[in-house]
């Protein structure tokens, strides 16, 4: 007789998952000499004990401590980019301006981007078949636990000034819901972030409003505001060229701007 | 020095096709925008079309929507407007015109021009 | 489609003297507005941008204002190389349109 299984409303852990975290930490470590001395297998063994045999809806962030413990890493505190809702430009931006970092550019970051994973409780068992949804059906699940954990670790890292692409085509340019709105921003440290300067990414050509006016974003200057934290914010018009000039700082279109 | 020479002009029969050619240079090409706009004798001017960076977008006036069509050769530093279906009303000088494209403000006017090409329509 | 209205058509000005110039727009369209200036035979000439930012090269007796639907071009002391027609042009919305133009001339 088949064994019952909770049905999650989300789908289930990314097939091949423990290879697939396995293998891009071995590529990371190869490619980041800083993080050489780390053991993938330890690592991994960090991971899978922060979600087996544990039901799926009662994960905490103490669970994932050893795996934290682990991937400690020292980013430069000042070349820090978050963002919301727009992670493949800002991914785009890192590739080419590679002393700034998005937390995918971090090794515990670089493990679980795209990925989903849960086990299912008193059984050593991954769950290929589904995972519980945020909203549908619990928010401390494995998948939410692990980037609310990694992410305020993230912004409390931070300094001097941190940069945040948003979404411009969004109807809610900033959303307090998001990782960035309800963990990221709430994390960084007065003490060592001087100004948290966002850039609005447009989404075409058709829309030349200030988004920076836009009243989303003049309630993260507000909420940032009131942590003694400046505010800056950057219409991005024409982000195709915002890439193009980051390759290509000297050509003269782009630093003839005023 | 920006230059942008156009040429392709010349007396077309109505329904006939015309293909303009605008060979840029004096600056990096991939990094603007480009458009083409247009002054019928006598008249005043009308955009027609422009096309983004890598030719990701193209925009057109409804005048001219479904008969025109932009792009470039960003490899050739040249823009082209190839022209179909052609009417008396099209009758017009051809300019074609750089967008200064900023990142951080908005544009949308044109900064430098070429000395237009003249397409005349008529049987 | 934005319709972009210029006044007058014609201005007769004597060299030396002020020119003002108007634009307005069927609807606001911010301060994305530009002016241009052409010769007979010639291309457009970029003079401002921005409804108030000169271009490279404009000499400062060129001036722009104005926000939303009325703008204004003025042309502080009037050269005999200014004598020419003088368009607007909004780019806030897709398409972008010209005014019908304004033609200077010597009185």
């Known amino acids: 007789v088949p064994r019952w299984r909770q049905q999650w409303s989300g789908p289930g852990t990314t097939k091949r998952f423990p290879e697939t975290v396995l293998a891009r930490c071995v590529k990371y470590t190869e490619i980041h000499p800083e993080m050489r001395h780390v053991d993938c297998q330890s690592v991994w063994d960090a991971f899978k004990g922060a979600f087996i045999s544990k039901h799926p809806c009662n994960i905490t962030e103490e669970d994932y401590q050893p795996l934290m413990k682990l991937g400690t890493q020292t980013v430069p505190c000042n070349k820090i980019l978050l963002w919301s809702r727009i992670k493949d430009l800002a991914h785009q931006f890192t590739q080419v301006q590679r002393d700034m970092f998005t937390l995918e550019d971090t090794l515990l970051g670089y493990l679980a981007d795209d990925l989903t994973w849960c086990g299912e409780f008193n059984t050593s068992k991954i769950n290929y078949q589904s995972c519980p949804d945020w909203r549908k059906d619990c928010s401390n699940n494995p998948v939410s636990v692990f980037w609310k954990t990694v992410s305020r670790r993230f912004a409390e890292a931070a300094c001097d000034v941190v940069h945040v692409m948003l979404n411009g085509s969004r109807s809610k340019i900033f959303d307090k819901n998001s990782t960035f709105g309800s963990v990221e921003v709430h994390n960084l440290q007065p003490e060592k972030v001087q100004t948290l300067e966002a850039w609005v990414i447009h989404g075409g050509r058709e829309d030349s409003r200030d988004l920076c006016q836009d009243p989303t974003i003049k309630e993260l200057e507000s909420i940032i505001s009131k942590r003694n934290i400046q505010f800056s914010c950057k219409n991005i018009y024409r982000p195709d060229k915002f890439l193009q000039c980051v390759k290509n700082p000297e050509d003269s279109s782009c630093t003839s701007e005023i | 020095e920006v230059q942008l020479l156009e040429s392709g002009g010349g007396l077309v029969q109505p329904g006939g096709s015309l293909r303009l050619s605008c060979a840029a240079s004096?600056?990096?090409?991939?990094?603007?925008?480009m458009s083409w706009v247009r002054q019928a004798p006598g008249k005043g001017l009308e955009w027609v079309s422009t096309?983004?960076?890598?030719?990701?977008?193209?925009y057109y006036a409804d005048s001219v929507k479904g008969r025109f069509t932009i792009s470039r050769d960003n490899s050739k530093n040249t823009l082209y407007l190839q022209m179909n279906s052609l009417r008396a009303e099209d009758t017009a000088v051809y300019y074609c015109?750089?967008?200064?494209?900023?990142?951080?403000?908005?544009?949308?006017?044109?900064?430098?021009w070429g000395q237009g090409t003249l397409v005349t329509v008529s049987s | 489609e934005i319709v972009m209205t210029q006044s007058p058509a014609t201005l007769s000005v004597s060299p030396g003297e002020r020119a003002t110039l108007s634009c307005r727009a069927s609807?606001?369209?911010?301060?994305?507005l530009a002016w241009y200036q052409q010769k007979p035979g010639q291309a457009p000439r970029l003079l401002i941008y921005?409804?108030?930012t000169r271009a490279t090269g404009i000499p400062a007796r060129f001036s722009g204002s104005g926000s939303g639907t009325e703008f204004t071009l003025t042309i502080s002391s009037l050269q005999s190389e200014d004598f020419a027609v003088y368009y607007c042009?909004?780019?806030?919305?897709?398409?972008?349109?010209f005014g019908q133009g304004t033609k200077v001339e010597i009185k």
């Open positions: 921005g409804a108030s």
């Open positions: 015109a750089r967008d200064p494209s900023y990142i951080y403000s908005t544009s949308g006017y044109f900064d430098y």
């Open positions: 004096g600056f990096t090409f991939s990094f603007y925008d």
């Open positions: 096309i983004t960076l890598h030719g990701g977008d193209t």
């Open positions: 042009q909004q780019y806030n919305n897709w398409p972008w349109t």
């Open positions: 609807q606001s369209v911010s301060s994305n």
